[in-house]
């Protein structure tokens, strides 16, 4: 899973994989993110040794374990890798570090009159990766509101110097803030000339290409196909550059492919990984773990989720299968890349997508695997639906959950409104794991408009269903994606693999949860149900939740949440987190809205003017 | 991968009972739910029933008026379909079939159930 | 019960030709529709549902689209594999129904 937390004063003993200089502990921790092998890192500011040579020292490292054993000391900044950290995964760096002079290979030198022009000077120049900036006060002043733009072999500083009234700072080409633009075109049966700077096995001339956007030191590249005439030359990709930053020439070459880095592109950038899946070819490397599973997408899956896995096999042949899974083979290599990549197998192979930041826009989640009493802690992208719906008035703070159920709508409780009933005063956040992570500047959506079931009176048990139309549609990601709704006669009359979640209180008088919590939760039926409640009305539109002796249930705050259950392989929003007598106590199951029963009443709200449906529901 | 395996043809008399059998292999078979779906013979498709061997929740078509009881063994992941009182309009053949999502993604090989007498 | 009225109910057509047929529900199903194909002699083999698009295996010439009470199945250049006969069915309320089906021939 992600692990975002830094360690102050600690340092990582041992599974070194690389060395470099950054300018601080977040540069390091996006380097080790992208470092194919890096899982966690070590940082040495200035300020943690008098070892000069040490000094801004940054220490990817890689365990066998995920972990190494921290020795204390003093300023040194330690962490993990943000690998399967999704949003949190990108290479933009926007800092200017005061008084620190970034050495490089410097190739250009301007008069400048800020140190943000020289950074978009930079950011504009095809070969500038880092730069360094002499102020108006620096002590020489022939080199007074100089504006040096460097580069280097590894794209990152050769040696960091403290230096006073000197600013550096990095490109931001991966912002995708770049004036230069793009080259989109491929180029087939064309090879380019000049310097090779790195040589990796690719599957294709498109997974070529993103390797080459995210190289320090790429520019173009060259990648040999598969029916290439030299077999040990077969999907070789190799990465590009040269001193005027394109190919000084270019050789019509039969079963070659060209292209250039993306890195200069305007406003978007390729994602950092690889989701096609290629039939028919297997990747060679170490092997990390065999595990039989249910298809090709489920190898992938497990290759994400294994935060070492780079790559995977999922072979076919008979001995590898037993009933309907099968081998999936899961793989890594120093470089990232398959070490051999062979054709016309019976296997299926693909890449991990450890450093996806964004999914696909299916229209409803259907492949994922209260605070809640007796929960655990959610992890990214396991519950894409779950929004935290909350009530800026003085302060801010978590009221409800809800569920996103398409672009522009969440399904929620009818009582989370209950005397707040003013759209404005509503924020919603989605995507989000843990509360604490949300900041004045975290994103949120407004309300629109919120529709409450016509049938639903304050106090009362029945209808307690709402929809929530937000100002602006939402993006689909890989953490923020709707949940199938069921449809009206769901033939299931008890579901056997349902969860709750929510970041309510963990106990009866508790407090709110800061990560995402989940609780597996059978369902009870309704007749059941109304003999632990016989002062109520148990509806057919309602379904009840719980253990019999108690222990673990939905709680204040998970009001609104989604009771989900596995059906037929898909996730399905069965029901809304709505009442109950305290918090899992013995024989008292929790009560929920039951979606089925209102599907009507969605579709109706849902739908516009045109009766085409804006939610979203499986398709 | 997901099979599902139909008993043979039955030959049966008007108002006797007929239980076809459907055997599962290739995937958990408690997870997903069962159906059944019969066609006579040049006719369309009609939906009776289905089980959810995990819970033992059945749903049926009311157009059967209680004669049809759809069963699941777990311990041969097997499920049953039974129809009583049988009539000519009830020849057909018969299908098991089993959902991803809703729509039938497997569907056993049929089995012909003639009633005649 | 939800009525699902499919036309025309048989066809003939060529190699190459685009095919369209449509379904029609007696009141809303939303996009809660599967298509399915069957041949003599065999079960039916889903196509594409409203739950999960295309399935796995079937040939990109054939598309749905449709929300509501309307939809269609079209097979944009037919080939010798597809004549057969055509179901859509509804999965929005129990009864699950069917569509009486379409049968394409040859011409």
């Known amino acids: 899973g992600c692990l975002t937390q830094l360690y102050e004063n600690a340092f990582f003993r041992g599974g070194d994989v690389a060395s470099m200089y950054t300018p601080n502990a977040q540069y390091c921790q996006m380097r080790c993110t992208f470092h194919p092998r890096c899982l966690l890192f070590s940082f040495l500011p200035a300020s943690s040794i008098n070892d000069m040579e040490k000094r801004f020292g940054c220490f990817l490292k890689d365990s066998v374990t995920g972990t190494l054993p921290k020795v204390h000391r003093t300023g040194a900044v330690s962490g993990h890798s943000l690998k399967q950290c999704g949003h949190q995964i990108s290479a933009c760096h926007r800092d200017i570090y005061k008084g620190v002079d970034m050495r490089g290979v410097n190739f250009n030198v301007s008069k400048v009159s800020s140190v943000e022009e020289c950074q978009k000077r930079c950011t504009s120049n095809i070969r500038c990766q880092f730069f360094s900036y002499a102020t108006q006060t620096f002590h020489k002043a022939e080199y007074r509101n100089n504006c040096l733009l460097k580069y280097s072999p590894g794209g990152t500083p050769t040696a960091i110097k403290v230096l006073s009234n000197v600013e550096s700072g990095f490109s931001l080409k991966p912002c995708a803030l770049s004036e230069i633009g793009c080259h989109m075109n491929i180029f087939q049966h064309l090879a380019f000339s000049d310097v090779d700077v790195a040589r990796v096995l690719t599957p294709d001339a498109f997974v070529c290409r993103t390797i080459c956007t995210y190289h320090p030191n790429c520019l173009f590249f060259t990648f040999y196909t598969n029916v290439w005439k030299i077999e040990s030359q077969r999907n070789v990709c190799l990465l590009k550059t040269s001193e005027s930053g394109t190919p000084s020439s270019s050789t019509p070459q039969e079963n070659t492919i060209s292209g250039y880095s993306l890195l200069t592109c305007k406003r978007t950038l390729p994602e950092p990984c690889h989701s096609k899946i290629y039939p028919g070819v297997d990747f060679g490397g170490e092997e990390l773990n065999v595990t039989f599973v249910k298809g090709v997408n489920v190898c992938q899956e497990t290759c994400t989720k294994m935060i070492r896995c780079q790559f995977f096999t999922y072979s076919l042949l008979p001995e590898d299968c037993k009933e309907e899974k099968c081998k999936c083979f899961l793989r890594l290599s120093m470089d990232g890349s398959p070490t051999r990549i062979a054709y016309g197998t019976q296997g299926s192979s693909g890449y991990s997508l450890r450093l996806c930041n964004t999914g696909d826009n299916s229209v409803c989640t259907t492949k994922t695997s209260t605070r809640i009493v007796g929960g655990t802690n959610s992890s990214w992208g396991e519950w894409p639906w779950q929004v935290s719906l909350q009530v800026k008035l003085t302060a801010q703070r978590h009221l409800c959950g809800g569920s996103l159920i398409g672009h522009q709508w969440v399904l929620t409780a009818a009582h989370c409104f209950d005397g707040l009933p003013l759209q404005d005063v509503w924020r919603i956040y989605s995507g989000i794991l843990n509360l604490s992570d949300i900041t004045k500047d975290t994103p949120f959506s407004q309300i629109k408009e919120i529709i409450i079931h016509q049938n639903y009176k304050v106090s009362e048990g029945n209808h307690d269903i709402a929809l929530i139309k937000l100002q602006a549609p939402l993006n689909y990601t890989e953490f923020q994606k709707p949940i199938c709704l069921p449809s009206k006669g769901d033939t299931s009359t008890i579901y056997t693999n349902c969860w709750v979640t929510g970041w309510g209180f963990s106990k009866e008088k508790g407090e709110i949860q800061n990560i995402l919590q989940k609780v597996n939760i059978p369902l009870v039926t309704n007749e059941e149900c109304q003999k632990r409640y016989q002062d109520y009305k148990i509806t057919q539109r309602m379904v009840c939740a719980g253990y019999k002796e108690g222990g673990k249930d939905a709680c204040k705050g998970d009001s609104g949440g989604p009771l989900v259950c596995k059906h037929n392989g898909m996730w399905r929003l069965v029901g809304i987190t709505s009442w109950g007598e305290g918090c899992a106590r013995r024989e008292q199951p929790g009560v929920y809205t039951k979606v089925a029963e209102y599907m009507d009443w969605i579709l109706e709200k849902t739908q516009s003017s045109d009766g085409k449906a804006q939610m979203q529901s499986p398709a | 991968q997901v099979q599902l395996v139909q008993s043979g043809a039955e030959v049966k008399k008007p108002g006797a009972s007929v239980k076809v059998s459907c055997k599962a292999s290739g995937y958990t078979f408690t997870d997903y739910e069962m159906h059944w779906v019969r066609q006579p013979p040049g006719k369309g498709l009609e939906w009776i029933g289905a089980i959810h061997p995990g819970s033992g929740g059945t749903a049926y078509n009311q157009k059967f008026k209680g004669r049809v009881t759809i069963t699941a063994d777990e311990s041969t992941s097997t499920a049953y379909m039974e129809l009583s009182s049988l009539t000519s309009e009830d020849t057909a053949v018969y299908y098991c079939a089993r959902p991803y999502g809703y729509p039938f993604a497997y569907w056993g090989q049929g089995t012909l159930v003639t009633v005649s007498s | 019960d939800i009525q699902m009225t499919q036309s025309p109910s048989s066809l003939s057509a060529s190699v190459g030709d685009r095919v369209t047929i449509t379904c029609k529900a007696s009141e809303d199903i939303y996009n809660r529709l599967a298509w399915y194909q069957q041949k003599p002699g065999q079960a039916p083999r889903l196509l594409m549902s409203g739950e999960t698009g295309l399935e796995a295996g079937v040939p990109s010439r054939f598309s749905g689209s449709g929300s509501g009470t309307d939809f269609t199945l079209t097979i944009s250049s037919l080939q010798p594999e597809d004549f057969a006969t055509y179901y859509c069915?509804?999965?929005?309320?129990?009864?699950?129904?069917f569509g009486q089906g379409t049968k394409v021939e040859i011409k």
């Open positions: 069915q509804q999965y929005w309320s129990t009864p699950w129904t």
